[in-house]
């Protein structure tokens, strides 16, 4: 028998520095977690103690904090090189700055293989990107070899900006021939490393003959055996064992997100490469693990540029951006409109001639807007200003909901109207009319939504049984502010870009902004 230790991360999303327990900005250092300096300490400790160790990342290193906004992926390559990652799979967010934003800072600079078997380049890009990412890589580990085959969510064209010269194939269809190729090369220990979410990870384990272990990402799935060490609630045991169609036991793992945990999986293979045992758990990277001093010093050096960036002008406003709770928790506010417009703009993807865009709607809890921006400061808007408006370090995510769920959400928006509560929704691509004289749960009298399958966008009545795509804060997708119906009834959820980054990119693109209150939210006569 031969033992392999797999250390793994996924969905780190730019958390190079240590964070608070909820993965937002670190405030009290003695209670902070994660970060690459602490990760390196633990990785080195395990490398010293155990003979056959692989350090793998399952994608979405890109996007999530000011580190990515400023360094655009150079920070990912630099610090992953420093930690000596053995391989990485491409995630959807690796394409957020287009293919060039992946090639130059990361693919050309990484000293480790970057993998995806189901992304195929065509046209002029094919020769430009050739060899910069691979379908698989065979890695020597001790006296053995291990094959790593990569995969990426086929939804990436809807979630990011991969352009028109990359084709995202079905994961299982694309993986099988690559695994077969590894088998013909006499590689009998194969890890599928990828970024398509836990459900697809399990399907890969079940369907792809020859895959021994699946290391996944995208769904931020927390698996744990025993009593979990922090706030995350396990979605299942670690590892999650899937019985494949050909009768093998395939461990499937994921390590939550944001670098809070280091996945730790020990696998025992027999002489034919069959997995015969597996055990482990994610390791919570809390303050009991010291930050490595040399990596920490490097982080501090790179940090300087971030502090300078946050006070630079992104663009200008020529109107007052009303982000006050007195407005945003009671009525349509122009800060809410600005944010929703930015959210839709960030999700423009012309992937189908029948649709002007795949999504037209945005909802945003008024309580998530924490500050106004005064235009009387020469109109200047900085990252620092936006951080005051959106201080929670959330993401703007894409969900699919039935019309009936949206109707419930809008009823919830005003079920206790007038108490300055955060659930009052700001909107984009939606016209809503409330009648507050009616009883809670029956106050939405009109709900029209902007069409997507149209050449000239117009507002049509919401259909209860239709499935709609909506952009919203991750806070709402997770049922925050009482929106349990969203969490319980959503049909799909893909995490998106950092909230501040979305708005800052929009403002930089527009240069001058002047959002208005324009009748997106109305109250029928006699009730308000």
């Amino acid at each position: 028998a031969w033992e392999l230790t797999i250390l793994h991360t996924n969905d780190v999303h730019s958390r190079l520095e240590q964070t608070s327990e909820d993965s937002s900005k670190c405030v009290n250092a003695s209670r902070c977690m994660g970060g690459v300096a602490r990760l390196f300490t633990k990785v080195q400790q395990i490398r010293r103690a155990e003979p056959n160790v692989l350090l793998l990342d399952a994608g979405d290193q890109y996007q999530g904090t000011i580190w990515f906004t400023v360094y655009k992926g150079a920070e990912v390559a630099h610090f992953m090189n420093a930690l000596r990652y053995d391989a990485m799979a491409l995630g959807n967010h690796e394409f957020d700055n287009g293919v060039e934003g992946l090639i130059e800072p990361l693919l050309k600079e990484a000293k480790f293989p970057i993998l995806s078997a189901n992304i195929k380049a065509k046209g002029p890009l094919a020769s430009q990107i050739s060899g910069l990412y691979l379908p698989y890589k065979v890695l020597p580990v001790g006296d053995e070899v291990v094959g790593i085959v990569g995969y990426t969510s086929k939804e990436t064209p809807f979630l990011s900006n991969p352009g028109t010269n990359l084709v995202f194939e079905d994961e299982i269809t694309a993986l099988q021939p690559e695994v077969d190729k590894l088998k013909t090369l006499n590689v009998n220990k194969i890890i599928a490393l990828g970024h398509s979410g836990f459900e697809m990870d399990k399907l890969i384990a079940q369907k792809v003959r020859g895959v021994d272990v699946v290391v996944g990402g995208h769904s931020n799935t927390f698996l744990y055996t025993g009593n979990p060490p922090s706030k995350e609630v396990p979605a299942g045991k670690y590892p999650f064992i899937v019985t494949s169609d050909d009768g093998r036991k395939v461990p499937v793992v994921q390590a939550y997100a944001f670098g809070k945990y280091l996945g730790y999986l020990k696998i025992e293979f027999d002489e034919r490469g069959n997995v015969i045992s597996s055990h482990g758990n994610p390791i919570l990277l809390n303050s009991s693990i010291p930050e490595d001093p040399s990596i920490k010093a490097d982080i501090n050096k790179w940090r300087i540029k971030l502090d300078n960036y946050s006070t630079q002008e992104l663009g200008k406003t020529i109107v007052y951006l009303d982000g006050s709770s007195q407005s945003c928790r009671f009525r349509e506010c122009n800060m809410g409109n600005l944010i929703c417009d930015a959210m839709i703009n960030n999700n423009l993807r012309h992937t189908d001639e029948m649709f002007w865009n795949h999504v037209s709607m945005c909802i945003l809890n008024g309580g998530g807007i924490r500050s106004p921006i005064d235009e009387r400061n020469n109109g200047t808007i900085t990252w620092e200003n936006l951080a005051a408006v959106l201080p929670f370090g959330g993401t703007f995510d894409l969900v699919q909901l039935k019309g009936s769920t949206l109707k419930k959400a809008f009823e919830h928006s005003v079920h206790r109207y007038g108490q300055s509560t955060g659930e009052f929704l700001q909107v984009g691509g939606i016209h809503v009319v409330y009648d507050l004289s009616r009883k809670p749960g029956d106050r939405v009298v009109k709900l029209d939504v902007l069409c997507t399958k149209c050449r000239v966008p117009s507002y049509d009545p919401l259909k209860m049984d239709e499935v709609y795509k909506v952009i919203l804060p991750n806070f709402l997708a997770n049922g925050g502010d009482g929106f349990q119906m969203i969490k319980d009834e959503l049909l799909r959820h893909d995490s998106g870009d950092q909230d501040i980054n979305v708005v800052s990119t929009y403002i930089s693109k527009m240069k001058v902004i002047y959002p208005a209150v324009e009748g997106r939210i109305k109250f029928s006569t006699g009730s308000h």
Epitope: A1, E3, T225, G226, N227, K237, F240, I241, V242, T243, D246, G247, R248, K249, Y264, K266, E268, D270, R272, N274, I276, S277, S278, H279, G280, N281
Partner: antibody
Framework: EVQLVESGGGLVQPGGSLRLSCAAS????????MHWVRQAPGKGLVWVSR????????GYADSVKGRFTISRDNAKNTLYLQMNSLRAEDTAVYYC????????????WGQGTLVTVSS | AIQLTQSPSSLSASVGDRVTITCRAS??????LAWYQQKPGKAPKLLIY???SLESGVPSRFSGSGSGTDFTLTISSLQPEDFATYYC?????????FGQGTKVEIK
């Protein structure tokens, strides 16, 4: 109801051979990994051998390697243990055990069959 | 091979007592540990898997805890049918190994 019934035990002389069987019922035998575990009189449990669901991979404790052979017939829902070159120290109750499909532990055991190696 | 050391090797207790049995592994095994109960002349019966998960149908007075190298089986209130021998077993690697057993006898 899951049932595992061992048979084939008995008295055998040192150097002799014996073939144990374990008849499985109440579950899809061909989907499960199976094991043999033994227990010498008055002693603790000792793992002996393992076979995966399709029979393509097997494993043995060092003490029986080269002498014992585990096999299965999925069409007959039966697990076997062929024991050759038996020694006095192989005297024990032999249990077959089913490994849980989504884990690595034994969730069901048979009642055991006694093997006595003595001259 | 990973060695498992159970303690005590035997204990005497009365009905209603709280009983604790420990199992120490010679190296870290995460939560890859099971506990079995065996009565004389009978097959072992699974009580606890993954160190702390209760097998269905097993009374809730049985509980398991621990991870890494140190594990505990607890019977919160001993019942007459609980007098038996208890074994821990690791399933983190081959060969699968068992503790030497703890015999729980009537005081």
């Amino acid at each position: 109801e899951v049932q595992l019934v061992e048979s084939g035990g008995g008295l055998v002389q040192p150097g002799g051979s014996l073939r144990l069987s374990c008849a499985a019922s109440g579950f899809t035998f061909s989907s499960y990994w199976m094991h043999w575990v033994r227990q010498a009189p008055g002693k603790g449990l000792v793992w002996v051998s393992r076979i995966i669901s399709d029979g393509s991979s097997t494993g043995y404790a060092d003490s029986v390697k080269g002498r014992f052979t585990i096999s299965r017939d999925n069409a007959k829902n039966t697990l076997y243990l062929q024991m050759n070159s038996l020694r006095a120290e192989d005297t024990a109750v032999y249990y077959c055990a089913r490994e849980f499909s989504s884990g690595w532990y034994f969730d069901y055991w048979g009642q055991g069959t006694l093997v006595t190696v003595s001259s | 091979a990973i060695q498992l050391t159970q303690s005590p090797s035997s204990l005497s207790a009365s009905v209603g007592d709280r009983v604790t049995i420990t199992c120490r592994a010679s190296q870290g095994i995460s939560s890859a540990l099971a506990w079995y109960q065996q009565k004389p002349g009978k097959a072992p019966k699974l009580l606890i898997y993954d160190a702390s998960s209760l097998e269905s149908g097993v009374p809730s007075r049985f509980s398991g805890s621990g991870s890494g190298t140190d594990f505990t089986l607890t019977i919160s209130s001993l019942q007459p049918e609980d007098f038996a021998t208890y074994y821990c077993q690791q399933f983190s690697s081959y060969p699968r190994t068992f503790g030497q057993g703890t015999k729980v006898e009537i005081k």
